[in-house]
Interface confidence: low
């Protein structure tokens, strides 16, 4: 995967809330749980109110990108989804309030967002050929691919 | 600091209504959810729903359907707690409750005596 | 409905002595377990979230521990400011409930 210093040089700006209190299903059709308060995990659920509700923040790059570059917080909290390196779970991250302005090793904290007809994507910023995946029996990780699943439904208005 | 100030006892008849509030300061409702839950004398902690108040989406326990409605006022920072044909039953304490985004609470109001007699 | 077991009602301890108060979920709710203080008159606090995590606040010698089904709350060196009824929650699945509770008394 790309080293952070890769993209040091990059300045990612906060632009503003685009969507809020969404569900992410796998193509399992799981979705994502809290494990605990640091990690979380992929469950087939009878009652989608236990569901992980997500916001996603944009932000505007300062290489002028065309890819949409996200943040993910769990709704209604100060937790975000943090990447760390490949296979490894992605952590809950505390912060007092949604960054301004990232750069260098804070990009472990954002993800480019790709959209293919219903499947959705999240690639690390910080390692650019992983994605946020779900596992058999482990936590929400960063995968490059099959035999854990990548691509993810976003469902949206299920209060 | 967050403080939930609810507002004082009621005694009300059987068969009324009333509107029992909660006032926040120190957190913008908006960011939270509001919890209401009910405490009879030695019958432990019963939840009766909450509220979204930044879109009034309300949710409840099956069991005080037609009997509560929980409303938020964002512009007073304030949650309500309405309850509806009042018997024995609803005497209670009735505290709100901050709810995280896990459904634990982490404030809670200092509580609204509810007594119905006639 | 999940159904939140507190089997005993009361405990007595002495100041000084480790108590454990359990609570027993009809169902796996994993960690999604709460605990909360309600001293005589009072309004009930926060202790214990997400089964072992403590609020900032609570002094360390409330530990919870547990998982699935079964769950403690730990407390050592009891104190006489502990005189309360201990209540657990589950937040796992709607509607929330709460165990009957447990009143902790001092001799």
């Known amino acids: 995967s790309a080293p952070f210093s890769f993209l040091s040089n990059v300045k990612y700006n906060f632009m503003r809330i685009i969507k809020y209190e969404f569900i992410l299903n796998d193509a399992l059709n799981q979705s994502i749980i809290r494990a605990n308060d640091q990690y979380l995990t992929a469950a087939a659920l009878h009652n989608l109110d236990e569901a992980v509700k997500f916001d996603m923040g944009a932000y505007k790059s300062s290489k002028d990108d065309a890819k949409i570059t996200v943040i993910l917080r769990i709704s209604k909290t100060q937790l975000y989804v943090t990447a760390q390196d490949e296979d490894q779970p992605v952590l809950l991250k505390e912060m007092p309030e949604i960054p301004k302005t990232i750069t260098g090793s804070e990009t472990n904290l954002l993800f480019f967002w790709e959209t293919h007809g219903t499947k959705n994507y999240f690639t690390s910023v910080a390692h650019p050929n992983l994605f946020i995946a779900t596992k058999q029996d482990y936590w929400v990780c960063l995968a490059g691919g099959p035999p854990s699943i990548t691509d993810f439904q976003i469902l949206e208005n299920q209060a | 600091e967050v403080q939930l100030q609810q507002s004082g006892a009621e005694l009300v008849k059987p068969g009324a209504s009333v509107k029992l509030s909660c006032t926040a300061s120190?957190?913008?409702?908006?960011?939270?959810?509001m919890h209401w839950l009910k405490q009879r004398p030695e019958q432990g902690l019963e939840w009766i729903g909450r509220?979204?108040?930044?879109?009034?989406?309300?949710k409840y326990d099956p069991r005080f359907l037609g009997k509560a409605t929980i409303t938020a006022d964002t512009s007073s920072n304030t949650a309500y707690l309405q309850l509806s044909s009042l018997t024995s039953e609803d005497t209670a304490v009735y505290y709100c409750?901050?709810?995280?985004?896990?459904?634990?609470?982490?404030?809670w109001g200092q509580g609204t005596t509810l007594t119905v007699s006639s | 409905d999940i159904v939140m077991t507190q089997s005993q009602r009361f405990m007595s301890t002495s100041v000084g002595d480790r108590v454990s108060v359990t609570c027993k979920a009809s169902?796996?709710?994993?960690?999604?377990i709460a605990w909360y203080q309600q001293k005589p008159g009072q309004s009930p606090r926060a202790l214990i979230y997400?089964?072992?995590y403590r609020y900032s606040g609570v002094p360390d010698r409330f530990t919870g521990s547990g998982s699935g089904t079964d769950f403690t709350l730990t407390i050592s060196n009891v104190q006489s400011v502990d005189l309360a009824e201990y209540f657990c929650?589950?937040?796992?699945?709607?509607?929330?409930?709460f165990g009957g509770g447990t009143k902790l008394e001092i001799k």
């Open positions: 120190g957190l913008n409702i908006k960011d939270t959810y």
């Open positions: 509220i979204d108040p930044a879109n009034g989406n309300a």
């Open positions: 169902q796996n709710v994993g960690t999604n």
């Open positions: 929650q589950q937040y796992t699945r709607y509607p929330l409930t």
């Open positions: 409750a901050r709810g995280d985004g896990n459904f634990h609470f982490d404030y």
């Open positions: 997400s089964a072992s």
